[in-house]
């Protein structure tokens, strides 16, 4: 399954929007810093086959979309930027979904992939637990925004590698 040529551009636009969404200086939130345990092993392994990579990427984007379409998220960010950001994510989800479904039909997604998807789910569970613990404070959201930028950047690197493999 070939992702559209525009997909990489969408990724960069998503990252740009997320950067613009910042409302407070990260330096004012140093006390709120947190290690969420991003499952980097699931994204930077040389053993990465294309089929599992796509379904893990789909899970990552889906979880980011879920996080930023909550009621609490709406209250934290500029409405226009948030709307654009979520629209970009939704487009990426559609692209990835088509590939995931195609690979499921030809039975390409190995069972091993269940581990990676679960690791991504647990990562987002830690993020939501943190936001709850911090009562969805502006600094907590800023910490999460910076964390999602990092994970999106890493996933973008994986997508570029996948494209080069094709």
């Amino acid at each position: 399954c070939d992702l559209p040529e525009t997909h990489s551009l969408d990724n960069r636009r998503t990252l740009m929007l997320l950067a613009q969404m910042s409302r407070i200086s990260p330096s004012s939130c140093l006390m709120d810093r947190h290690d969420f345990g991003f499952p980097q092993e699931e994204f930077d392994g040389n053993q990465f086959q294309k089929a599992p990579a796509i379904s893990v990427l789909h899970e990552l984007i889906q979880q980011i979309f879920n996080l930023f379409t909550t009621k609490d998220s709406s209250a934290a960010w500029d409405e226009d930027l948030l709307d654009k950001f979520c629209t970009e994510l939704y487009q990426q989800l559609n692209d990835l979904e088509a590939c995931v479904m195609q690979e499921e039909r030809v039975g390409e997604t190995p069972l091993m992939n269940a581990d990676s998807i679960l690791a991504v789910k647990k990562y987002f569970r830690r993020i939501t637990l943190y936001l709850t613990e911090k009562k969805y404070s502006p600094c907590a959201w800023e910490v999460v925004r910076a964390e999602i930028m990092r994970s999106l950047s890493l996933s973008t690197n994986l997508q570029e590698r996948l494209r080069r493999k094709e």
């Epitope: 345990g37 092993e41 190995p110 581990d115 679960l118 690791a119 647990k122 830690r126 637990l129 943190y130």
Partner: antibody
Framework: EMQLMESGGGLVQPGGSLRLSCVAS????????MSWVRQAPGKGLEWVAS????????YYAPSVKGRFSISRDNSNNTLYVQMNSLGVEDTAFYYC???????????????WGQGTLVIVST | DIRVTQSPSSLSASVGDRVSISCQTS??????LNWYQQRPGKGPQLLIS???TLQSGVPSRFSGSGSGTDFILTIISLQPEDSASYYC?????????FGQGTKVEIK
């Protein structure tokens, strides 16, 4: 009865290699993440590595990354760790451990073997 | 990595005493803190998971409390068979990290 039985420990020279095995019984091995945890004689516990239920996710302690490799064979209910470039600091009892969930993190280590002793010495 | 600090490193108490062991983590681990008991010459055994969930078969004199960064293991009425080393461990992110251990002796 749920059981974990480690084997493969012994005396090895610095720079040498060793492969430990752990045979599981009494539970559905393929449904749980597994770990290796070590304990130097008279010292505390140190987590070494974890592998997801399907063998897809692998995590390592910084002290062993690049030297140790964890793997599993679900058809034979067996967990392995291949240990290379061993140093005297790797001398310890190595425990095979079952995790409470299918992949590492946000879990507990709810079942431990009796351990196998690895001695790295000249 | 998350640092886990346990105290005291050892304690001596009489049968029937109430004993508490403290565990602190360098960042919040929510409730993902586990406690283990290791008797001499044996492998560790899980006592309490997720800060306060007592494992099946573990006597009710053991209890755990806390969340975030501060946790406590309490033995309400110390028994001779409780002579062992106790370890806390964060299961929040890898690398999993353990406290240094607390050796409990019976006077």
């Amino acid at each position: 009865e749920m059981q974990l039985m480690e084997s493969g420990g012994g005396l090895v020279q610095p720079g040498g290699s060793l492969r430990l095995s752990c045979v599981a019984s009494g539970f559905t091995f393929k449904s749980f993440a597994m770990s290796w945890v070590r304990q130097a004689p008279g010292k505390g516990l140190e987590w070494v590595a974890s592998v997801g239920s399907q063998g897809g996710s692998k995590y390592y302690a910084p002290s062993v990354k690049g030297r140790f490799s964890i793997s599993r064979d679900n058809s034979n209910n067996t967990l392995y760790v291949q240990m290379n470039s061993l140093g005297v600091e790797d001398t310890a009892f190595y425990y095979c451990v079952k995790e409470t969930d299918a992949v590492a993190t946000m879990d507990a280590l709810d079942m431990w073997g009796q351990g196998t002793l690895v001695i790295v010495s000249t | 990595d998350i640092r886990v600090t346990q105290s005291p490193s050892s304690l001596s108490a009489s049968v029937g005493d109430r004993v508490s062991i403290s565990c602190q983590t360098s960042q919040s681990v929510n409730i993902y803190l586990n406690w283990y008991q290791q008797r001499p010459g044996k492998g560790p055994q899980l006592l309490i998971s997720a800060a306060s969930t007592l494992q099946s078969g573990v006597p009710s004199r053991f209890s755990g409390s806390g969340s975030g960064t501060d946790f406590i293991l309490t033995i309400i009425s110390l028994q001779p068979e409780d002579s062992a080393s106790y370890y806390c461990q964060q299961g929040y992110i890898t690398p999993y990290t353990f406290g240094q251990g607390t050796k409990v002796e019976i006077k």
